[in-house]
C-alpha cells in the first residue's frame, strides 16, 4: 500500500516518502523508487535553516550601512546573517531592518535602562528627592544635594528638574 504519512525528515510525493534536504542544502530532484532525494549545498551568501524541499536557497540578509546597520553575526549555509545597529542607534523591529537614534531623556526624567543595539533608551520620571536637568541618553536621575551633611540649609527647594540650593545657616547675633 502507498504510504499516507511519512517519517520525520521525509515528505510525501508521488505516493512515496522522500528524504528532505538537510539544512544548508536545496532540493535538486525528488526521490524515486531507485534514487534518493538529490540535494545541493546552498551557494555563497545563501542559506536554508531547516530540513526542507526548497528548490532555491534564501539570500543572506544585507546589513545596509546607509540604514545604520552592521553585521553582528555572519551568515552560514544554515543560518541567516544577523544585523545590529551602529553605536548610538537601535533596531526599529525584531527583524532589525533599519535603525533609529537612541532617544534622550528630557529634563525631569532619567535613564532607567541604557539603550542597546536592539532596544531604545527607557526613561523614568525623577521621583521626589531626585532631579535631572539635562537631556541625555545616559544620565540617571541624581539625588538632591543633602544640605545637612554640608552643615548648610535648604535655601531653595529642589524639583524634578533642579537641585536644591543650599545656603549658610542663620547665626544668632
Amino acid at each position: 500500500e502507498p504510504p499516507t504519512a511519512c517519517r520525520e525528515k521525509q515528505y510525501l510525493i508521488n505516493s512515496q516518502c522522500c528524504s528532505l534536504c538537510q539544512p544548508g542544502q536545496k532540493l535538486v530532484s525528488d526521490c524515486t523508487e531507485f534514487t534518493e532525494t538529490e540535494c545541493l549545498p546552498c551557494g555563497e551568501s545563501e542559506f536554508l535553516d531547516t530540513w526542507n524541499r526548497e528548490t532555491h536557497c534564501h539570500q543572506h540578509k544585507y546589513c545596509d550601512p546607509n540604514l545604520g546597520l552592521r553585521v553582528q553575526q555572519k551568515g552560514t549555509s544554515e543560518t541567516d546573517t544577523i544585523c545590529t545597529c551602529e553605536e548610538g542607534w537601535h533596531c526599529t523591529s525584531e527583524a532589525c531592518e533599519s535603525c533609529v537614534l537612541h532617544r534622550s531623556c528630557s529634563p525631569g526624567f532619567g535613564v532607567k535602562q541604557i539603550a542597546t543595539g536592539v532596544s531604545d533608551t527607557i526613561c523614568e520620571p525623577c521621583p521626589v528627592g531626585f532631579f535631572s536637568n539635562v537631556s541625555s541618553a545616559f544620565e540617571k536621575c541624581h539625588p538632591w544635594t543633602s544640605c545637612e551633611t554640608k552643615d548648610l540649609v535648604v535655601q531653595q527647594a529642589g524639583t524634578n528638574k533642579t537641585d536644591v540650593v543650599c545656603g549658610p545657616q542663620d547665626r544668632l547675633r
Epitope: 524515486t32 523508487e33 531507485f34 534514487t35 534518493e36
Partner: antibody, heavy 117, light 107 residues
Framework: EVQLVESGGGVVQPGRSLRLSCAAS????????MSWVRQAPGKGLEWVAS????????YYPDNVKGRFTISRDNSKNTLYLQMNSLRAEDTAVYYC??????????WGQGTLVTVSS | EIVLTQSPATLSLSPGERATLSCRAS??????LHWYQQKPGQAPRLLIY???QSISGIPARFSGSGSGTDFTLTISSLEPEDFAVYYC?????????FGQGTKVEIK
C-alpha cells in the same frame, strides 16, 4: 520465494533488434520498480534502464537512450527491454533486477546478448 | 555523472584474514550507497544497503561504513565462500553507477 527469469537473449547482427523478457514471481510485481543491468564479458556492472512500479516513469543512461525501451505488463508480471540499433558494445549478460528500498535486492540469472556479424 | 572508484582492484588474502575494500565517490553522495557480491558464473547479490545497513540472511562478518565520498566494506574474517568480486553502487542521482569492482582472491 522471489524469482526473476530472463529470456530472449541470443546472437544478433549489429543494427538489428532484440526484445528481452523477465518473468517475475513470488512478490507483488506491480508494487516494485524494476531495472535492467548488464555485464560485458569479463567486465563490471552497468545500469541500462529502470521503470517505476506503475510503468509511468522510465530512466536511461545516455548511451542507450533512444535505442532501448523498458516497459512492463503488470497483468502478466513481466518486464521487457526492447533493444534497437544494436552495437558490438551492447554484447553482455543482461540481468533483470527488482528495486527494493532503492537497492537492487533481487537479480535474475541473466540472459546473454551477443551482437556480432 | 557520479564516478565510483574502488580500490584495490585485487585483494589477495587468506581465509581468516580481515578484508577492507574501499569505494570513493567523485562527489558527496551522503549514505546513498549499496554493496553487492558476485561469484563467478552467478548473478550479483545485495550485501549492504544505505552504506552500513545489514541485510537479512547476510552473515554478520560483512559490515559497511562511511558517508559523503569515502566508503568501506569490511569482511571481518574471510570464509572460503567470500572470495568473489565486490561492487559498490550509488543511488544518489541519475544515472545509477557502479564501481569497477574489487576482486578478493585466495592468496
Amino acid at each position: 520465494e522471489v524469482q526473476l527469469v530472463e529470456s530472449g537473449g541470443g546472437v544478433v547482427q549489429p543494427g538489428r533488434s532484440l526484445r528481452l523478457s523477465c518473468a517475475a514471481s513470488g512478490f507483488t510485481f506491480s508494487n516494485y520498480g524494476m531495472s535492467w543491468v548488464r555485464q560485458a564479458p569479463g567486465k563490471g556492472l552497468e545500469w541500462v534502464a529502470s521503470i517505476s512500479s506503475g510503468g509511468d516513469d522510465t530512466y536511461y543512461p545516455d548511451n542507450v537512450k533512444g535505442r532501448f525501451t523498458i516497459s512492463r505488463d503488470n497483468s502478466k508480471n513481466t518486464l521487457y527491454l526492447q533493444m534497437n540499433s544494436l552495437r558490438a558494445e551492447d554484447t553482455a549478460v543482461y540481468y533483470c533486477t527488482r528495486a527494493g528500498g532503492k537497492a537492487m535486492d533481487y537479480w535474475g540469472q541473466g540472459t546473454l546478448v551477443t551482437v556480432s556479424s | 555523472e557520479i564516478v565510483l572508484t574502488q580500490s584495490p582492484a585485487t585483494l589477495s588474502l587468506s581465509p581468516g584474514e580481515r578484508a577492507t575494500l574501499s569505494c570513493r565517490a567523485s562527489q558527496s553522495i551522503r549514505d546513498n550507497l549499496h554493496w553487492y557480491q558476485q561469484k563467478p558464473g552467478q548473478a550479483p547479490r545485495l550485501l549492504i544497503y544505505y552504506a552500513s545497513q545489514s541485510i537479512s540472511g547476510i552473515p554478520a562478518r560483512f559490515s559497511g561504513s562511511g558517508s559523503g565520498t569515502d566508503f568501506t566494506l569490511t569482511i571481518s574474517s574471510l570464509e572460503p565462500e567470500d572470495f568473489a568480486v565486490y561492487y559498490c553502487q550509488q543511488f544518489n542521482s541519475w544515472p545509477l553507477t557502479f564501481g569497477q569492482g574489487t576482486k578478493v582472491e585466495i592468496k
